[in-house]
Interface confidence: low
Amino acid sequence: EIDPCHSQPCFHGGTCEATAGSPLGFICHCPKGFEGPTCSHRAPSCGFHHCHHGGLCLPSPKPGFPPRCACLSGYGGPDCLTPPAPKGCGPPSPCLYNGSCSETTGLGGPGFRCSCPHSSPGPRCQKPGAKGCEGRSGDGACDAGCSGPGGNWDGGDCSLGVPDPWKGCPSHSRCWLLFRDGQCHPQCDSEECLFDGYDCETPPACTPAYDQYCHDHFHNGHCEKGCNTAECGWDGGDCRPEDGDPEWGPSLALLVVLSPPALDQQLFALARVLSLTLRVGLWVRKDRDGRDMVYPYPGARAEEKLGGTRDPTYQERAAPQTQPLGKETDSLSAGFVVVMGVDLSRCGPDHPASRCPWDPGLLLRFLAAMAAVGALEPLLPGPLLAVHPHAGTAPPANQL
């Protein structure tokens, strides 16, 4: 019988154990700092711990706070060792403090909705302001138990840094509780209340007959009229009016964790799912040389696009990369800033039939609201950590 460990499949000093119960016939026990089926992936050191299961170590957005892990595939905790929560209502139930759970269906598969006691009004019946939450607000890591409107969604940590996505929406309407719950609440269906998460839209989704076709023809440079609807993602902006230079139109810079081996597919998935979710045309922008505007993070160019300032105490592990990403990296996951063009031509008061956020700031609030209620992460190929809107500018005058 062939010994599966004979070929020494474990890298970086990992020890091999033959086991019939494993898909590969062996298990590698990896040394500290490495992970993956063959210990080939570096688990980045992140302060006093390592980011497991492909998690990415990111500098804290706040000086004086430790770096943190951005976890993949539903894993959580400071080291990304907490296993993913089951989809839907579990068990265990995602609703805390005796909240009752009901299953919902949506783009990302089974979801859930909690009916909560009045004393714990968060989307998962959390108690904002609970003991232990004071020091965690705004530290860059979303603590679900501290997330709710009372604590500004853990100081913005659970809402893409936006302290109150529902600012301007009458607070006693509590539209944050009704947002994207699958039922239409007309009192929340307004710009300031983020259109009730589009729960009032009909049809709510691209018809199955069109969906595959529209997927296959999404942002391919040709306008597919049957896909040029809000529910089908406006064909990824392929049908947008030609009157403006798209290079200078509105855009969103997204900080997202993705896996480079499948980057193209993930960028496509990101653009399409956000187009369908936000009901606006979105696509990965190209620079003047025709390259995707996708930049590794941390990195100077990425942070410039995010509009943020660097923490001077953070040392880059590599020289800042100023070029758009080549596909040469082979690490399990990495942070990227993705610049997406946005077609808002169908939104706004002139298009009452197409109700969608008509400026990039409103798009940010909508995404922040989705993040706050836990509706965003299940849809995306990797965690979305930050969003920076650009309203669009006039192109510079020709230099003679």
């Epitope: 009752s100 009901s102 009916s115 909560c116 006691p117 009045h118 301007g168 929406c169 009458p170 006693h172 309407s173 509590r174 509780l177 039922q183 239409c184 609440h185 007309p186 009192q187 929340c188 269906d189 307004s190 710009e191 300031e192 209340c193 009032c200 009452p352 109700r355």
Partner: antibody
Framework: EVQLVESGGGLVQPGGSLRLSCAAS????????MSWVRQAPGKGLELVST????????YYANSVKGRFTISRDNSKNTLYLQMGSLRAEDMAVYYC????????WGQGTLVTVSS | DIQMTQSPSSLSASVGDRVTITCKAS??????VAWYQQKPGKVPKLLIY???TRHTGVPSRFSGSGSGTDFTLTISSLQPEDVATYFC?????????FGQGTKVEIK
């Protein structure tokens, strides 16, 4: 102080029409959903129609669908209910109210449908 | 449509008594329930919303509880000015519906 003042009620024959108005003051009218609720003499409360803050979404009770139209003019801080093909069972006091937990109500206007 | 069934339809109690009115929803409405008081010839007045939040200016003797399908309005110590009809209402989903009312009188 929040104030809602209805007007436009009165006596109308079956099959006739009326237009009710509700003048709002004391709050940012354009930020709130508004509703019409009615109460037949000696009976309970019934939601007639609701409109969201910008007028883009409306709801009607099955009993009035196709006969009544709710609208609003945010520049005039006014809510309207256009009632057509009126029937005896539409006879009630009509209240305009703010929000889904109706914290504020007008004093009501009586609609009498009789030949 | 979601039915809201109130009980009892009427009750008579003495001043100082604890009074409980219940409302049962025909399906889960979370905590999207309000309670109103309507005195004869007057406009309904909001007492409780989100099942247990007292509206501004409502005396503390009024309290609400419940979630899902079963809701309760309690008057901890009945006062003469509490003589009225009380309605529950769900606003979880359209059409928002009211209970048929509970008439409260003093013995």
């Amino acid at each position: 102080e929040v104030q809602l003042v209805e007007s436009g009620g009165g006596l109308v024959q079956p099959g006739g029409s009326l237009r009710l108005s509700c003048a709002a003051s004391g709050f940012t009218f354009s930020s709130y959903g508004m509703s019409w609720v009615r109460q037949a003499p000696g009976k309970g409360l019934e939601l007639v129609s609701t409109i969201n803050s910008n007028g883009g979404r409306t709801y009607y009770a099955n009993s009035v669908k196709g006969r009544f139209t709710i609208s609003r003019d945010n520049s005039k801080n006014t809510l309207y209910l256009q009632m057509g093909s009126l029937r005896a069972e539409d006879m009630a006091v009509y209240y305009c109210a703010r929000d889904q937990g109706f914290a504020y109500w007008g004093q009501g206007t009586l609609v009498t449908v009789s030949s | 449509d979601i039915q809201m069934t109130q009980s009892p339809s009427s009750l008579s109690a003495s001043v100082g008594d604890r009074v409980t009115i219940t409302c049962k929803a025909s399906q889960d409405v979370g905590t999207a329930v309000a309670w109103y008081q309507q005195k004869p010839g007057k406009v309904p007045k909001l007492l409780i919303y989100w099942a247990s939040t007292r509206h501004t200016g409502v005396p503390s003797r009024f309290s609400g509880s419940g979630s899902g399908t079963d809701f309760t309005l309690t008057i901890s110590s009945l006062q003469p000015e509490d003589v009225a009809t009380y309605f529950c209402q769900q606003y979880s989903s359209y059409p928002w519906t009211f209970g048929q009312g509970t008439k409260v009188e003093i013995k």
